[in-house]
């Protein structure tokens, strides 16, 4: 997956930290405070989408040789820059019933963007 | 994850056969000849991203959190529909050497969509 | 600590109007879904309606739709209830509850912290 | 929407009996239901979450299980101040239901 770097407008990954305090939510997040979760940005031409080697991968580069080919409904349908790759973080936090949790949060990090 | 049944118009996951024939695959894939692989189409409006319970919901909720208080950059940043729980399916096909190879290939079925 | 304290109620003519608020303290308001739940004198435990934590979403119960409006204030952490064509029926106490706007592996938080209630007696 | 049949609408038990509230979805919600007690006069306080964990500073006597569509709350041993009314929830879909209800009284 692509790095933004600035220079580059196709789909990639922007760094980026997430402050719990910003969006209120550290009145239920124990720790961390915040972390790098990151995001994805960018155009998705044609050519790249589903190039990315992507978990996405297969099901996105048939759907774009349907996108290619002109084939309804794909002509019209965007790919876009989403997470392809997603790590998970260890959190403590309060849970529903103000229970403190210490858990493996699935899919916080992105890790990689792809085009859909 | 919504189905799509011509009256939505929010992000929904739409059935839809996938013909190797059509994209010129079926001179390496074996079997099947084709499958019902779906695809992912509809709106995001901002309501509604990061709250599918699906696998990209955390990250999705929080840079929601993010974009619905303005902050920069994700005030412009689109949320988009995208597969958020893809299934394997097993397959019958040629590789790079000629050899025929049975194997389950990752996320070719999409079973449901989000918002990223 | 969390509190949420309803006020507006009162004796009120079918067909009137009245806005019930709920002020919110001890908490990131903003990041919170808020619900409306009423109870009818000797009666069961009724949902209302609901707002998303930012205003973008709202849901009421059939019984309400198209008299009562949810609606929220987060600079001044206060909730409200806009009910227009009260009937009989109407007659209740109104809790104003809060929800966490969050959910994982398809478990969606549900209502945590009520308010005392407010009154509404509709009367000619 | 989501019916949520609660039985018994009222039960007589005594101090240090073991009684068992029954709430049925008429279609599948997970785990996304809570147990509520209503003292009169007073608002809902949870007891459970997520059908089955006990909310925090809950006593331990009460208890939730099930999954889907049929979910229990029991209370192991009845205490003078348990008798009162218990209401389900469920919040898996809008609009969010409530059970009718079950009063325990004192036998």
């Known amino acids: 997956g692509l790095e933004c770097d600035g220079k580059v407008n196709i789909c990639c990954r922007q760094q980026f930290f997430i402050d719990f305090r910003l969006i209120g939510w550290n009145d239920w997040i124990i720790a961390p405070t915040g972390y790098y979760g990151n995001y994805c940005e960018g155009e998705c031409p044609s050519h790249i989408a589903g190039t990315s080697g992507s978990s996405l991968s297969f099901h996105s580069t048939v759907i774009n040789h349907y996108r290619m080919r002109g084939h309804s409904p794909f002509a019209n349908l965007k790919s876009c820059c989403v997470p392809t790759k997603l790590r998970p973080m260890s959190m403590l936090y309060y849970d529903d019933g103000q229970n403190i949790i210490k858990k493996d949060i699935q899919n916080m990090i992105v890790e990689e963007c792809g085009c859909s | 994850g919504l189905e799509c049944d011509g009256k939505v118009n929010i992000c929904c996951r739409q059935q839809f056969f996938i013909d190797f024939r059509l994209i010129g695959w079926n001179d390496w894939i074996i079997a099947p000849t084709g499958y019902y692989g779906n695809y992912c189409e509809g709106e995001c409006p901002s309501h509604i991203a990061g709250t599918s319970g699906s696998s990209l919901s955390f990250h999705s909720t929080v840079i929601n959190h993010y974009r619905m208080r303005g902050h920069s950059p994700f005030a412009n940043l689109k949320s988009c529909c995208v597969p958020t729980k893809l299934r394997p399916m097993s397959m019958l096909y040629y590789d790079d050497g000629q050899n025929i190879i049975k194997k389950d290939i990752q996320n070719m079925i999409v079973e449901e969509c989000g918002c990223s | 600590q969390v509190q949420l304290v309803e006020s507006g109620g009162g004796v009120v003519q079918p067909g009137r109007s009245l806005r019930l608020s709920c002020a919110a303290s001890g908490f990131t308001f903003s990041s919170y879904g808020m619900h409306w739940v009423r109870q009818a004198p000797g009666k069961g435990l009724e949902w209302v309606a609901v707002?998303?934590?930012?205003?973008?979403?709202?849901y009421h119960a059939d019984s309400v739709k198209g008299r009562f409006t949810i609606s929220r204030d987060n600079s001044k952490n206060t909730l409200y209830l806009q009910v227009n064509s009260l009937r009989a029926e109407d007659t209740a106490v109104y809790y104003c509850?809060?929800?966490?706007?969050?959910?994982?592996?398809?478990?969606?938080?549900?209502?945590?912290?009520w308010g005392q209630g407010t009154t509404v007696t509709v009367s000619s | 929407d989501i019916q949520m049949t609660q039985s018994p609408s009222s039960l007589s038990a005594s101090v240090g009996d073991r009684v068992t509230i029954t709430c049925r979805a008429s279609q599948g919600i997970r785990n996304n239901l809570g147990w509520y007690q209503q003292k009169p006069g007073k608002a809902p306080k949870r007891l459970i979450y997520a059908a089955s964990s006990l909310q925090s500073g809950v006593p331990s006597r009460f208890s939730g299980s099930g999954s889907g569509t049929e979910f229990t709350l029991t209370i192991s041993s009845l205490q003078p101040e348990d008798f009162t009314t218990y209401y389900c929830l469920q919040h898996n879909s809008y609009p969010w239901t409530f059970g009718q209800g079950t009063k325990v009284e004192i036998k």
């Open positions: 707002i998303w934590y930012d205003g973008s979403n709202k």
């Open positions: 509850v809060r929800s966490r706007n969050w959910n994982y592996d398809n478990y969606y938080y549900g209502l945590d912290v």
